[in-house]
């Protein structure tokens, strides 16, 4: 039952003009000599949003992005000329597009850019304290960016910097063919995925990387990569894309003979996000676009939100699927994919799996294997030839929590906020699109907490011209959303309660967990507030039960739209 398939109409539809006039958006419209404001790093402590763009890195004040500092980091004329002579576009390609921007330590960030098809990295000093107001490039210390940033600005890097080590999924060559997951920096030898083996990675596009603990023992920590890639022949008829989750042990140092300086614990599994079709054939949303991890009380089990689109040119659709880490782990503990039989088909591997099971992190938890270099040859050879799992990971409830079809846009980004409301906690999704709009959606349980209904609260246009939203960050501290695109950066509050109208019924019908009727206006709901007059009903949106102030009036039929 897809309530979400009906392309439900937003409670509020706000144009860019309306957003501006109601002071609900602040925009930084970019610099004349820059673009591609795609790489975000949120620093709640310093109250800064760092943004990597073309030839620039910005430090925006989270309170108001109109207040910013900038670092100019272009390439030399020589580099730019070399790039041009290699047949690249001088404006779109022969510049330093920032692709990696991570916190390195208490005082520095680590940044990498394409360097006009010659990747380069450096450190940025930001100081110890917010009041230090330091933001400067360490131009005395540049590092080779190969395996950290792609050469081509059209490609993304999924990166994660932990304990002084940079994990990155990117293309490591000029041609953009040698895609790999790397670990660089730190004191150890760089490690990467096996080269020229399509079983490991098959022309992937990396989305994001996350550290997720496996147990209470930090030795078991894993880094998970989300990406999409071409399905290997035999997995699918015709050319198809598969969404993937890949895992690597943080303490993987490669093999002792085979897989030397290569991951020995890399495994990947397919992420399914599909709906049953009328003809019995599922419609798959395979083009993974973005991932957001919603942390729970248990750091081992965040909820994974994924934004997907269809591969089809005929049928344009987007979906949001949720995954549980326990389901992911179950798949990684399941059968490995193995090619066998007369047609060389993928089948579940039925033979003896070596010990310790490939993909297990070496630790005291599992039999005293202190390092991946200590693994016996059979574990390494098996790992090398069986990087994929046979079973896919299905979403929670085996279906998307939201789908959008036959609309003129597709989803590109997602962030999620967990909001305390009068009747429980709700996850509010902010979904960016390829036309510069943001959808604000709340998941509301129907009969059970498993059966979710999507309520589309708002559809906001946040850029003057239609543009693909390529980055989003949410500040719970500031209660603001920050949005990046080629054109610039936008900032908007997470809630606009006053826009829902001047009556209790309208406030209640909005079903926005951020908002409640306080007796005189629709305003921000705080669960700690003692006011008994707070009226809110996210689950049912029923004003009759919750509004006894006669505020139902004849306005109930036109609360839906602002044009």
């Amino acid at each position: 039952n897809y309530a979400n398939g009906k392309n439900n109409v937003p409670r509020l539809k706000l144009s860019y003009k309306e957003m501006l006039e109601s002071n609900n958006v602040i925009t930084f419209n970019g610099l004349a000599n820059s673009s591609s404001y795609h790489t975000f790093l949120l620093d709640e402590e310093r109250s800064r949003l760092y943004v990597g763009a073309k030839d620039h890195i910005f430090s925006f004040n989270l309170v108001n992005i109109k207040d910013f500092q900038k670092i100019v980091w272009p390439v030399s004329y020589t580099r730019r000329d070399e790039c041009k002579w290699a047949g690249k576009d001088i404006l779109k390609e022969c510049a330093n597009f920032i692709k990696v921007l991570k916190a390195y330590n208490q005082t520095h960030l680590y940044a990498c850019g394409t360097g006009a098809f010659h990747p380069i990295c450096t450190y940025i000093e930001v100081g110890h304290h917010p009041e230090d107001n330091i933001f400067k490039l360490q131009d005395s210390h540049f590092e080779n960016g190969r395996g950290k940033s792609p050469y081509d600005p059209k490609l993304l890097t999924a990166s994660l910097l932990i304990d002084g080590e940079l994990y990155s999924g990117t293309a490591a060559d000029f041609m953009g063919r040698d895609f790999a997951i790397f670990r660089t920096l730190g004191h150890h030898h760089p490690i990467r995925t096996e080269q020229h083996d399509s079983r490991w990675l098959n022309d992937p596009r990396f989305i994001s990387a996350h550290l997720i603990p496996e147990s209470d023992n930090p030795e078991d920590d894993k880094v998970y990569f989300f990406f999409r890639e071409n399905a290997i022949d035999g997995e699918h008829s015709g050319k198809a894309t598969h969404a993937r989750i890949g895992q690597i042990c943080k303490n993987d140092f490669g093999g002792h003979r085979s897989l030397v300086n290569k991951w020995t614990t890399f495994l990947k599994a397919r992420l399914i996000c599909s709906v049953p079709g009328p003809n019995g054939i599922d419609t798959h949303f395979d083009e993974l676009q973005d991932v957001f991890l919603m942390n729970s009380k248990d750091p081992k089990n965040p909820i994974v939100y994924g934004v997907f689109t269809t591969s089809s040119n005929i049928f344009k659709g987007s979906a949001v699927c949720m995954y549980s880490m326990s389901d992911v782990r179950r798949v990684f503990l399941g059968p490995y994919a193995h090619r066998d039989g007369p047609n060389y088909q993928w089948v579940p591997y039925q033979g003896r799996v070596p010990y310790p099971r490939p993909g297990t992190c070496p630790s005291k938890t599992f039999g005293g294997f202190d390092s991946t270099k200590d693994l016996p040859d059979d574990v390494i050879t098996f790992a090398r030839s069986h990087p994929a799992m046979y079973n896919p990971v299905f979403p929670i409830n085996n279906r998307p929590i939201m789908i959008k079809t036959d609309v003129n846009y597709q989803f590109t980004q997602i962030v999620v906020d967990r909001v305390d409301a009068e009747d429980g906690q709700y996850d509010v999704m902010f979904i960016g699109t390829d036309v510069g709009t943001v959808l604000k959606v709340v998941s509301v349980p129907k009969e059970t907490w498993h059966d979710l209904e999507e309520v589309l609260l708002e559809e906001m246009t946040v850029f003057r011209e239609p543009t693909t939203i390529s980055a989003m960050e949410l500040s719970t501290k500031q209660q603001q959303l920050y949005i990046g695109s080629t054109a610039g950066v936008a900032q908007l509050p997470l809630h606009r309660c006053d826009i829902y109208g001047k009556a209790c019924a309208e406030c209640c019908l909005a079903r926005d967990p951020y908002c409640a009727w306080d007796g005189s206006s629709c305003s921000r709901y705080f669960p700690t507030a003692k006011a008994r007059t707070r009226a809110q009903d996210i689950r049912n949106g029923d004003p009759l039960t919750h509004c006894s102030d006669g505020g139902i009036e004849g306005r109930m039929d036109h609360h839906h739209h602002h044009h």
């Epitope: 002792h256 005291k364 005293g368 200590d374 040859d377 059979d378």
Partner: antibody
């Protein structure tokens, strides 16, 4: 120079037990897998057991599983093989071997175990 | 388990001749094959590891080749001290297994 010296072999009754020891020197003992390989009179070589560097896990063929236990004391540079429920077919020369993660590069001179009925 | 078949069981040659010993695996084992030499009353010693890697201290006349299922140990020109029993061993997967051996004897 790598040296492996086995001891503890001898004559034992059917169903009896025996503990073999191997004193290692000339290399960093704790940095290597260690193994036991045996050779029945006039026969070929048979792998008996391999233990990982830390001693936390060991591998056995079905022929000795649940009867033999390999162990090591890295502080004493010593490898052990505890053999229980001995059978006539366990009669062999038992070699202590350095390696087992890959190839077995150094072998002791062996100790003879004879199981009599 | 992986079965290793060595052939011939006995090879009779004269000093100075070339010896070719074969080892066949029941399934593909990549290059995870090692060769050992054993003389009467002595412990085996490692000659070649991972199919073709030579060991320091082992004469250059010993060489190994092959991968997958078929492997060869070659002694280019036999010396009197080379007459012994030769074993192959797979390290591809547990349980480790040895071939039955090839006895190289003086003709």
């Amino acid at each position: 120079e790598v040296q492996l010296v086995e001891s503890g072999g001898g004559l034992v009754q059917l169903g009896g037990s025996l503990r073999l020891s191997c004193a290692a020197s000339g290399f960093t003992f704790s940095s290597y897998y260690m193994s036991w390989v045996r050779q029945a009179p006039g026969k070929g070589l048979e792998w008996v057991s391999t233990i990982i560097k830390s001693g936390g896990y060991a591998y056995y063929p079905d022929s000795v599983k649940d009867r033999f236990t390999i162990s090591r004391d890295n502080s004493k540079n010593t490898l052990y093989l505890q053999m229980n429920s001995l059978r006539a077919e366990d009669t062999a020369v038992y070699y202590c071997v350095k390696g087992g993660q890959g190839a077995m590069d150094y072998w002791g001179q062996g100790t003879t175990v004879t199981v009599s009925s | 388990e992986i079965v290793l078949t060595q052939s011939p069981a006995t090879l009779s040659l004269s000093p100075g001749e070339r010896a070719t010993l074969s080892c066949r695996a029941s399934q593909s084992i990549g290059d995870y094959l090692h060769w050992y030499q054993q003389k009467p009353g002595q412990a085996p010693r490692l000659l070649i590891y991972y199919a073709s890697q030579s060991i320091s201290g082992i004469p250059a006349r010993f060489s190994g080749s092959g991968s997958g299922t078929d492997f060869t140990l070659t002694i280019s020109s036999l010396e009197p001290e080379d007459f012994a029993v030769y074993y192959c061993q797979q390290g591809y997967s547990f349980p480790y297994t040895f071939g039955g051996g090839t006895k190289l004897e003086i003709k």
